[in-house]
């Protein structure tokens, strides 16, 4: 399962698409800035096993996919870019699912500590709540787009876990 390479390639492609999706200048949205508190500290001190890293990455990508698959999202972004971005996310989810299957020989490793998954879900709930409060305004979506780019770039510790043999 050559995940580190395929994942970083797809991740880079997704980031490029996300960057291209920007429609308005981030500077015109400074008043809408928000602290979403990505659960970085929780992950930083933790040594992830391979299946656990896969599990958290899948959670982040699935939640991002959920967020960008809503009707409100369709109205906010250029359709062909949104579709390419969503397709990239879907391919990443497939890669991660297939990787768990290939880890069969070592799969007594638990998939994930529930606390990490809940931390990711709460983070995305905060994003969803923010969008609702801001009535899905163009600036709110711009703030969220920038936030997702940050969270995508973050996952250094998780990627280290992908290289590890369980």
């Amino acid at each position: 399962c050559d995940l580190p390479q395929t994942h970083s390639l797809r991740n880079r492609r997704a980031l490029i698409l996300l960057a291209q999706m920007g429609r308005i200048s981030p500077f015109s949205c400074l008043k809408d800035r928000h602290e979403f508190r990505f659960p970085e500290e929780e992950f930083d001190g933790h040594q992830f096993q391979k299946t656990q890293a896969i599990s958290v990455l899948h959670e982040m990508i699935q939640q991002t996919f959920n967020l960008f698959s809503t009707e409100d999202s369709s109205a906010a972004w250029e359709q062909s870019l949104l579709e390419k971005f969503s397709t990239e996310l879907y391919q990443q989810l497939n890669d991660l699912e297939a990787c768990v299957i290939q880890e069969v020989g070592v799969e007594e490793t638990p998939l994930m500590n529930e606390d990490f998954i809940l931390a990711v879900r709460k983070y995305f709930q905060r994003i969803t709540l923010y969008l609702m409060e801001k009535k899905y305004s163009p600036c709110a979506w711009e703030v969220v787009r920038a936030e997702i780019m940050r969270s995508f770039s973050f996952s250094t510790n998780l990627k280290k876990g992908l290289r590890r043999k369980d």
Partner: antibody, heavy 126, light 110 residues
Framework: EVQLLESGAEVKRPGSSVRVSCRAS????????ISWVRQAPGQGLEWMGR????????NYAQNFRGRITITADKSPLTAYLELSSLRFEDTAVYYC???????????????????WGQGSLVTVSS | EIVLTQSPGTLSLSPGEGATLSCRAS???????LTWYQQKPGQSPRLLIY???SRATGVPDRFSGGGSGTDFTLTISRLEPEDFAVFYC???????????FGQGTKVEIK
């Protein structure tokens, strides 16, 4: 919680086609696949295929390729199963089924069927 | 393609007894992707156990799942009258996504 509501029973002639619909309501996401699973009278469950409504991506079981088409509308979230060149052995209850967004971790979510429709009986008879 | 074989085909037991149902795969299956369902006559299947051993919401703790590799089991510690039904195991494989069901084990009242 997701509710899946399927269309009513159908009686069809051999060689014809059938279209079954499945409307999802509740906590639905177009970013999770909707599958079709059938069950012949007194028999077991057989997965036929799935669609990811957000992208329209489909995957079909080998046994049905060439005869099956699954489509979906995103609003309201509805999946459709079309099966052509019907044979007597296609007589079955057709279920739509979907994963749960609440399963922790999400990587398990798409590997199972947490919610099922009530089933739609399709009878192939001459 | 993976084939799941369930045994026995039928299990005749009395309420209060324990039951062990087997699901054997033709090749290695990730236990994370092994699921069990219960189906009563005239009803849709109901999710019971997922990830090999996690109980779905509302499933009593008398139901437990285990196993790895090619051999999986569903155990019901003490059968209640409402437990009598057909039980199916199901695996997931990707890519491409394929869901495979066992042929089912019927647990009937003796």
């Amino acid at each position: 919680e997701v509710q899946l509501l399927e269309s009513g029973a159908e009686v069809k002639r051999p060689g014809s086609s059938v279209r079954v619909s499945c409307r999802a309501s509740g906590d639905t996401f177009s970013s999770y696949p909707i599958s079709w699973v059938r069950q012949a009278p007194g028999q077991g469950l057989e997965w036929m295929g799935r669609i990811l409504p957000a992208l329209g991506v489909t995957n079909y079981a080998q046994n049905f390729r060439g005869r099956i088409t699954i489509t979906a509308d995103k609003s309201p979230l509805t999946a459709y199963l079309e099966l052509s060149s019907l044979r007597f052995e296609d007589t079955a209850v057709y279920y739509c089924a979907s994963p749960s967004a609440d399963i922790i971790p999400s990587i398990l979510g798409t590997t199972l069927f947490a919610f099922w429709g009530q089933g739609s009986l399709v009878t192939v008879s001459s | 393609e993976i084939v799941l074989t369930q045994s026995p085909g039928t299990l005749s037991l009395s309420p209060g007894e324990g039951a062990t149902l087997s699901c054997r795969a033709s090749q290695n299956v990730s236990r994370h992707y092994l699921t069990w369902y219960q189906q009563k006559p005239g009803q849709s299947p109901r999710l019971l156990i997922y990830g090999g051993s996690s109980r779905a919401t509302g499933v009593p703790d008398r139901f437990s799942g285990g196993g790895s590799g090619t051999d999986f089991t569903l155990t019901i510690s003490r059968l209640e009258p409402e437990d009598f039904a057909v039980f199916y195991c199901q695996s997931y494989h990707s890519p491409p996504p394929v869901y495979t069901f066992g042929q089912g084990t019927k647990v009937e009242i003796k």
